[in-house]
Amino acid sequence: VPRWRQQWSGPGTTKRFPETVLARCVKYTEIHPEMRHVDCQSVWDAFKGAFISKHPCNITEEDYQPLMKLGTQTVPCNKILLWSRIKDLAHQFTQVQRDMFTLEDTLLGYLADDLTWCGEFNTSKINYQSCPDWRKDCSNNPVSVFWKTVSRRFAEAACDVVHVMLNGSRSKIFDKNSTFGSVEVHNLQPEKVQTLEAWVIHGGREDSRDLCQDPTIKELESIISKRNIQFSCKNIYRPDKFLQCVKNPEDSSCTSEI
């Protein structure tokens, strides 16, 4: 008789999850010389230990502490790029501007990017059928708690001028319920962070509105100002040109507004 299994509303663990995490870890340590000595099996064991045999709606930040310790990494604190709802462009940017880092450019962010995982209470099995959905099932699920934990730590580490890339095509350019809005904004340290600079990325080619005047951006400015951090905002009217100018800043067309 097949054992009854909890059916969750979200997709199950990404197939070949253990192999994927291990392979990503090895690849990351090969690309980043400062991580060359890292034992990826230990990293995977700590990752696994955070959610295996635990109820997938009862995961805590504490469960991830062994992994956080092993994943400790020094990123230049004044070169941090946060993003909300515009991951691809943020990653394209840091691939060109190699001295800037998104969370997914760190080991832990790189390991988990675009993956789903969960286990089952009291069994060592990984659940490949379904995992809890943040809205429909529970917020304290393995994936959500992981991103909340690493995002908080990433924001806490930031200093000087912190940049955030926001999607100007969305109805809420700044969304209080996003990871950026609910976690990162509130964990920037005013004693270390001088300014949060928002880059609002325009979607339409003919869109010349000043999206820095958007009510949600004003809301972000208000939250940030109340935390004694300065706020500035820039419109990026042409994201394609923006990336091109990051690649080739000497290009004559890059002096005009982008």
Epitope: P33, R36, H37, V38, D39, Q41, S42, V43, K69, L70, T72
Partner: antibody, heavy 119, light 110 residues
């Protein structure tokens, strides 16, 4: 065959200087991270310095006990690793080994050169 | 300079199995690979085990390494008189940005 040959050791008074060399052969020196490790008489191994390959930034690392006094460097055109030792102290007396990395561990060691700091 | 913790001595009779432990912290053994070196008097250290449990070619399979959490161990089975030597564990330490060695274990074959 991979070979590492240290030279430059000797007797030096406290406060003096020495430059150790390590001539490498049998592998692509340019790509290798390299280290110096020492062993005081009758004692255990103690890491001194490591230098990355130029392609990995050429970054040097040194133990706190030698920081500001010892400098690791490399000359890829000569396949040679160096350790410039200044302000030498009695506690720096040791056999100094040079070692090559195989990605993330030290796999081959030289035979060592003896440094004695004494007046 | 802090070191990884090893017992100063170990002993066994020929044919026996002996184990040498090496303990550290999260910033060295916990996070990074452990390697083992064998050293005979008056000679340079020789790589015995790398990346926790891998044996370089030429090292007999009587030697094995393992790691769990912040500790590692070297096991020698079927002990032979020629195994009498000093054994050192080593791991990179991310806090120090450098290598840490164990204090060394002198193995005596009785």
């Amino acid at each position: 065959e991979v070979q590492l040959l240290e030279s430059g050791g000797g007797l030096v008074p406290p406060g003096g200087s020495l430059r150790l060399s390590c001539a490498a052969s049998g592998f692509t020196f340019t790509n290798a991270w390299m280290s110096w490790v020492r062993q005081a008489p009758g004692k255990g191994l103690e890491w001194v310095s490591t230098i990355r390959s130029k392609t990995d930034g050429g970054t040097p690392y040194s133990a706190d006990s030698v920081k500001g006094r010892f400098t690791i460097s490399r000359d890829d055109s000569k396949n040679t690793l160096y350790l410039q030792m200044n302000s030498l102290r009695a506690e720096d007396t040791a056999v100094y080994y040079c070692a090559k990395y195989d990605y993330n561990y030290m796999d081959v060691w030289g035979q060592g050169t003896t440094v004695t700091v004494s007046s | 300079q802090s070191v990884l913790t090893q017992p100063p001595s170990a002993s066994g009779t020929p044919g026996q199995r002996v184990t040498i432990s090496c303990s550290g912290t999260t910033s060295n053994i916990g996070r990074n690979y452990v390697h083992w070196y064998q050293q005979f008097p008056g000679t340079a250290p020789k790589l015995l085990i790398y990346r926790n449990s891998q044996r370089p070619s030429g090292v007999p399979d009587r030697f094995s390494g393992s790691k769990s959490g912040t500790s590692a161990s070297l096991a020698i089975s079927g002990l032979q008189s020629e195994d009498e030597a000093d054994y050192y564990c080593a791991a990179w330490d991310d806090s120090l940005n450098g290598w840490l060695f164990g204090g060394g274990t002198k193995l005596t074959v009785l």
